[in-house]
Interface confidence: low
């Protein structure tokens, strides 16, 4: 079975979670993208994601989760803003490809927040919570009609090192199954 | 067009056991959990657990565990929910229900089996 | 387990007028990364498989008239039927998707008065 590598982020409450998840350029450019959450090795739920076609540099704002493809670099550009420490988790991007499997971009995101310093309002310099301007953006798609039993894993042990390149088949039919607490995909 | 067709009506003995299938077609099978839901006559809806048709990995509510053991034939895109140690209040309709959205609903059901566990 | 609680147990309303249904939760649904209840409606006619009516709340399922609406977060949740007709006579359940195991409301039997 493929091996999952995770990326861990130490963020305080308030602050803002910028990753960018990199994809095949040719192959994947258009596909309509998503950013989803994996409690403690549960079934991935989509948060968010892009509209289908996927468009270029186009901010989608779902809640405080604000996903921008970029299809010039290759990439997925995902923040999340003013960070609660219940957004703790395990996080994935994953391209969708009906009517194939969705395809789960590496390496996952382990996020943990940890509440701010006490103290006025703002005080904490890396504070994004009043000073973060989220864009104007229009969200016309809902996340697709589409959830894959596939992708569903469990969390990989923190020595896994192997990490499949991006456009390799993955399969993880083999992986021990979950238990599934926020509830489904 | 999404279809689950369920097999039909079982009358059962208590103590017996009961496999109910569930025929999917319009989609692909192992694409999407299979949930099992169930209703006694004249009452509510009470989810008894999933499968996953790809890994054949499962979760059952804690009221069935030990008693309920579901699987899966995906050479012929069928899913099977088997209930042992039958009791009379066993007795209800049984369905197999599929998400369209994630976390979002249930959007396809079966026509419903009818369980009688009668003595 | 969270608790659906649904009020009232039935309900009788004139052809055209508008019924409420209600639904609580023990905990809240909404998951705050995405500001979406995980909260279904849905409606089931006599010897019929439920059929799906609201997801996320307040969000109408394809095909669904536009008579019925969802609203409300959290904790608390409304199904209306701005204008029944007789063919919305049925029970409708509440359904709360956020924790595992899913629960669903008693529900609430409509009829027309």
């Known amino acids: 079975a493929t091996k999952l590598t995770e990326e861990k982020y130490e963020l305080k409450e308030g602050q803002t979670l910028d990753v960018k998840c990199d994809y095949t350029l040719e192959k994947f450019a258009s596909s309509q993208k998503a950013w989803q959450i994996i409690r403690d090795g549960e079934m991935p739920k989509t948060l968010a994601c892009t509209e289908r076609p996927s468009k270029n540099s186009h901010p989608v704002q779902v809640g405080r989760i604000i996903l921008e493809d970029y299809h010039d670099h290759g990439l997925l550009r995902v923040r999340m803003v003013n960070l609660q420490v219940e957004d703790s988790g395990l996080y994935q991007c994953v391209i969708y490809q009906p009517p194939k499997e969705p395809h789960m971009l590496f390496d996952r995101i382990r996020l943990v927040v940890t509440k701010g310093f006490s103290g006025t309002p703002g005080s904490n310099e890396n504070s994004t919570q009043n000073v973060y301007k989220i864009p104007p953006t229009t969200t016309k798609a809902l996340c697709p009609l589409y959830t894959s039993p596939r992708t569903v894993t469990q969390a990989p042990p923190k020595s896994t090192a192997d990490v499949s390149t991006p456009d390799s088949e993955i399969n993880l039919t083999n992986v021990t199954d979950i238990i599934r607490v926020p509830v489904f995909n | 067009q999404v279809q689950l067709v369920q097999s039909g009506a079982e009358v059962k003995k208590p103590g017996a056991s009961v496999k109910v299938s569930c025929k999917a077609s319009g989609y692909t099978f192992t694409g999407y959990y299979m949930h099992w839901v169930r209703q006694a006559p004249g009452q509510g809806l009470e989810w008894m657990g999933w499968i996953n048709p790809n890994s054949g990995g499962t979760k059952y509510a804690q009221k069935f565990q030990g008693r309920v053991t579901m699987t899966r034939d995906t050479s012929i895109s069928t899913a099977y929910m088997e209930l042992s140690r039958l009791r009379s209040d066993d007795t209800a309709v049984y369905y197999c229900?599929?998400?369209?959205?994630?976390?979002?609903?249930?959007?396809?059901w079966g026509q419903g089996t009818l369980v009688t566990v009668s003595s | 387990d969270i608790v659906m609680t649904q009020s009232p147990d039935s309900l009788a309303v004139s052809l055209g007028e508008r019924a409420t249904i209600n639904c609580k939760s023990s905990?809240?649904?909404?998951?705050?990364?995405?500001?979406?209840?995980?909260l279904a409606w849905y409606q089931q006619k006599p010897g019929q498989p439920p059929k799906l009516l609201i997801y996320?709340?307040?969000t109408r399922e394809s095909g669904v008239p536009d008579r019925f609406s969802g609203s409300g977060s959290g904790t608390d949740f409304t199904l209306t039927i701005s204008s029944l007709q007789a063919e919305d006579v049925a029970v409708y359940y509440c359904?709360?998707?956020?924790?595992?195991?899913?629960?669903f409301g008693g529900g609430t039997k409509v009829e027309i008065k």
């Open positions: 229900a599929r998400e369209r959205h994630s976390s979002l609903g249930y959007a396809y």
């Open positions: 905990q809240s649904v909404l998951f705050s990364s995405n500001n979406k209840n995980y």
């Open positions: 996320w709340a307040s």
């Open positions: 359904q709360q998707f956020f924790l595992a195991p899913p629960t």
